[in-house]
Amino acid sequence: TQNKALPENVKYGIVLDAGSSHTSLYIYKWPAEKENDTGVVHQVEECRVKGPGISKFVQKVNEIGIYLTDCMERAREVIPRSQHQETPVYLGATAGMRLLRMESEELADRVLDVVERSLSNYPFDFQGARIITGQEEGAYGWITINYLLGKFSQKTRWFSIVPYETNNQETFGALDLGGASTQVTFVPQNQTIESPDNALQFRLYGKDYNVYTHSFLCYGKDQALWQKLAKDIQVASNEILRDPCFHPGYKKVVNVSDLYKTPCTKRFEMTLPFQQFEIQGIGNYQQCHQSILELFNTSYCPYSQCAFNGIFLPPLQGDFGAFSAFYFVMKFLNLTSEKVSQEKVTEMMKKFCAQPWEEIKTSYAGVKEKYLSEYCFSGTYILSLLLQGYHFTADSWEHIHFIGKIQGSDAGWTLGYMLNLTNMIPAEQPLSTPLSHSTYV
């Protein structure tokens, strides 16, 4: 008789990342009988929702349903129908919604309420929509990359099955850059974490981890740009802002109402004698870098050492995975290679920012101008944040690995979030069991 393949015993999970600039839906899959093993969960799909982040729907909440429809229907297609009812769905909103909540708790609740009602209409096991804390965002990003890198596995291997593996169990730090916030998370070396708000204790797979994390709200790349513009327009003599962070020849009109709409620019707000101003790019990396540094207050530190704005930061330790916008921006600029030194990155940025806007548009004809125009700022911001903000040096730069995916799964907080909420990371090391029938060759 012919052997008939048994139906694969798998499970699925869905996490929506409701970020400040967009929403992405991730579908994860894992073998049901290996739930507690490390590294078995992998991403099978990413669906990027067309449009901006959910906080933008504050005046049009009744459109959230149609906005989410295509990606939720995609999930319905990808996951077998027999699994729909047992597939958990989680939505986590990050800094865009944290900012909206700062402005109005009522409006943020209304947006989340409509999101919940929309997601409840699908045949999955909807588990709720919530705004996650910056601390959670940092922690889950750290869990994700170390889970995917096999750092929680107790088995030592003589060969490497994942990139960046140094064959030791030393965890990677996590550097996450979004549109509205940025997170830094790592295990410091024998250092007490001086501020309790930045300390996390985990027991994972039988091992204790003392983790440092901080999320800098308003220091994501989009909000940092708004901050810089609000700071610089204060000292502009008229409604022309000559800006070194944009290419020579670039021009753009900005509404003052848009500039002051975000809580991130409140500290720079002033009454201006105009409703609009024009950015005129002058494309100078060094001046752009200097302007960005003014966003970081390094004059005050109540601890032994700080990042900026009086926030404790222990000495950096080990390797770091830099993902999300750290990766997307550096990938666009072709600066993700392990071989590119920090000095080389700076040189390339100087050249890139100095290129005339007309030339840039011709070279990258397929890229939306809004995004294209901001790579000079974003690249310069990344360098400023990593070097002056987090105190990486030319030497320690080689410990930063710009990571998009690990083993086919996106680096980011969503996988760690799902692993935690589905109880798939045990505190203790699971006991080894004899081979199951499915393991026989």
């Epitope: 400040s20 600039s21 967009h22 067309k50 449009g51 901006p52 982040g53 933008k56 729907f57 005046q59 049009k60 149609i66 906005y67 429809t69 295509d70 229907e73 865009g96 549109g179 989009d222 900005v254 509404n255 848009d258 939306k368 809004k370």
Partner: nanobody, 124 residues
């Protein structure tokens, strides 16, 4: 520019059906979403039903199970089949075609086109 022309409105008795049509012409490649809004006297304009370029649909709770939106891409037309009509469905129905902006500044919608509206009256 996109032009939208609605048809199919009228006076109908409660419990009966109507089918609205909206023909789109012009630069419609930039449009991902099409839908129907309605506005009763003294009320705000509300989204009734919408459909994406991939044919996925979404409905207001008040019309779920009674109204069906569909799209014929070959004819650049969107339809709203309205069954089991109630007096509270009385309103001017507007066809809308739009796409969202990806940006955190400026308006939510990058493209936003409206028809002139067609009156639907449900009365015995």
């Amino acid at each position: 520019e996109v032009q939208l022309l609605e048809s199919g409105g009228g006076l109908v008795q409660p419990g009966r059906s109507l089918r609205l049509s909206c023909a789109a012409s012009g630069d419609i490649f930039s449009i991902n979403y099409m839908g129907w809004y309605r506005q009763a006297p003294g009320n705000e304009r509300e989204l009734v039903a919408a459909i994406t370029g991939r044919g996925n649909t979404n409905y207001a709770d008040s019309v779920k199970g009674r109204f069906t939106i569909s799209r014929d891409n070959s004819k650049n037309t969107v339809y709203l089949q309205m069954n089991s009509l109630k007096p509270e469905d009385t309103a001017v129905y507007y066809c809308n075609a739009w796409d969202y902006s990806d940006y955190d500044e400026g308006p939510l919608r990058e493209y936003d086109y409206w028809g002139q509206g067609t009156q639907v009256t449900v009365s015995s």
